[in-house]
Amino acid sequence: DGCKDIFMKNEILSASQPFAFNCTFPPITSGEVSVTWYKNSSKIPVSKIIQSRIHQDETWILFLPMEWGDSGVYQCVIKGRDSCHRIHVNLTVFEKHWCDTSIGGLPNLSDEYKQILHLGKDDSLTCHLHFPKSCVLGPIKWYKDCNEIKGERFTVLETRLLVSNVSAEDRGNYACQAILTHSGKQYEVLNGITVSITERAGYGGSVPKIIYPKNHSIEVQLGTTLIVDCNVTDTKDNTNLRCWRVNNTLVDDYYDESKRIREGVETHVSFREHNLYTVNITFLEVKMEDYGLPFMCHAGVSTAYIILQLPAPDFRAY
């Protein structure tokens, strides 16, 4: 069918509560495109009827609510004027109950479930609620160890819990709860968050910063050798992994047989407040199949991509 397949990360979700996933894949979805959702390679698109428990809402797939049988691989097909991409999203549903907020043992957990507060600082936790505009979210309540949080040090501000003067005792299991309204029906959303405390505020907080690349394209001739650095700043005591991936697979694994594209050895320079890490990707020979494919640099929760592009023809040579 001429569509290019892209495999996204697994999403691990909670049964009996709403869930939504937005089909966006920069730079593909930045122009005029049509998006259609399918389940498990079905030829029949997901319903667009808003009364359906599972339906497509603009570029989103919306589950109201998620159920056990909803686990599986969902595809969203993005059709542009000259392109077609099929994005595969693996959704795994597990049963999470009220106050079951310690979910660190689950595989591939999103970092939304694991957050850090900085000792002695004013900091915040975020309740990640990703839903389309048709969903109206009520005020958020916050819990710790199954009890509602209160006290002058805690302030709820939109989707955040502000914690002033963070102490070691603020570690533990939190949950944020909101009521979602859609088409006159109400649903409860409950997200568990495991919170740890770190003593260092570090360089720019706890999230690694990718200095380069910056989600851009690189013009490169077919058949040439190309080396691209990923430069990352991070705290000195960080435990983040830095790597290059393509189609959500480590490049060394993806090109295991040909070894045509490889990840380099990581190096770092130590500064007083932070470290600067560099890990490169080497294309021994750029092939046609490499063009238009996002090569992602990952650093903890941060990502940035490059896309190889054929140079525009130079008409001055003719």
Epitope: D100, K144, D145, C146, N147, K150, G151, E152, S167
Partner: antibody, heavy 116, light 107 residues
Framework: QVQLVQSGAEVKKPGASVKVSCKAS????????MNWVRQAPGQGLEWMGM????????RYAQKFQGRVTMTVDKSTSTVYMELSSLRSEDTAVYYC?????????WGQGTLVTVSS | DIQMTQSPSSLSASVGDRVTITCRAS??????LNWYQQKPGKAPKRLIY???SLDPGVPSRFSGSRSGTDFTLTISSLQPEDFATYYC?????????FGQGTKVEIK
């Protein structure tokens, strides 16, 4: 570090009341619930109730409802547990336990003996 | 109210033995369960928080796990200082409830 220091042992007559104190230090007192747990001689642990120092909200176990009163003095970071209409089966060690993270820290215990 | 059924009520073991203590909740409590060690005349000391998180300073021979509403405390290699009484506590919903306790004695 976190410390919960309780008042000393008490001997009471049946029908009387006892008030046990628990002074907290080393953490933000008004941010977390404080629980009371008791243990009769040679027996297991029994949750009595809890209080939040921020707004004095209380939750009591059904068994102690009407007999127990938990109060707080924010100025001294102290929580109090008063048990009235004492009977011999109330003879126990009474502990306060903070819920900074669920029942993380415990006081040293206060022995209350009810005897005629 | 949620009942916590702890077993065995007592056990005799030798230094170096692997010891397993179980608590069963009468209804779902998620991971909201702690394990405590208590020695005579002392306050309980928390060993494990939220089913499986080891408290700071607690030896790694202690571990906690869960299967549905069954919770297990395991001591991989019993040491002389481990002879004590162990309790589980559910804090998923009040009234909070403890298991009846397991006394670990020297064989």
């Amino acid at each position: 570090q976190v410390q919960l220091v309780q008042s000393g042992a008490e001997v009471k007559k049946p029908g009387a009341s006892v008030k046990v104190s628990c002074k907290a230090s080393g953490y933000f007192f008004t941010s977390y619930w404080m629980n009371w747990v008791r243990q009769a001689p040679g027996q297991g642990l029994e949750w009595m109730g809890m209080i939040h120092p921020y707004d004095s909200e209380t939750r009591y176990a059904q068994k102690f409802q009407g007999r127990v009163t938990m109060t707080v003095d924010k100025s001294t970071s102290t929580v109090y547990m008063e048990l009235s209409s004492l009977r011999s089966e109330d003879t126990a060690v009474y502990y306060c336990a903070s819920s900074t993270t669920a029942f993380a820290y415990w006081g040293q215990g206060t022995l209350v003996t009810v005897s005629s | 109210d949620i009942q916590m059924t702890q077993s065995p009520s007592s056990l005799s073991a030798s230094v170096g033995d692997r010891v397993t203590i179980t608590c069963r909740a009468s209804q779902d409590i998620g991971n909201a369960l702690n394990w405590y060690q208590q020695k005579p005349g002392k306050a309980p000391k928390r060993l494990i928080y939220a089913t499986s998180s080891l408290d700071p300073g607690v030896p790694s021979r202690f571990s906690g796990s869960r299967s549905g509403t069954d919770f297990t405390l395991t001591i991989s290699s019993l040491q002389p200082e481990d002879f004590a009484t162990y309790y589980c506590l559910q804090y998923a919903s009040s009234p909070y409830t403890f298991g009846q306790g397991t006394k670990v004695e020297i064989k």
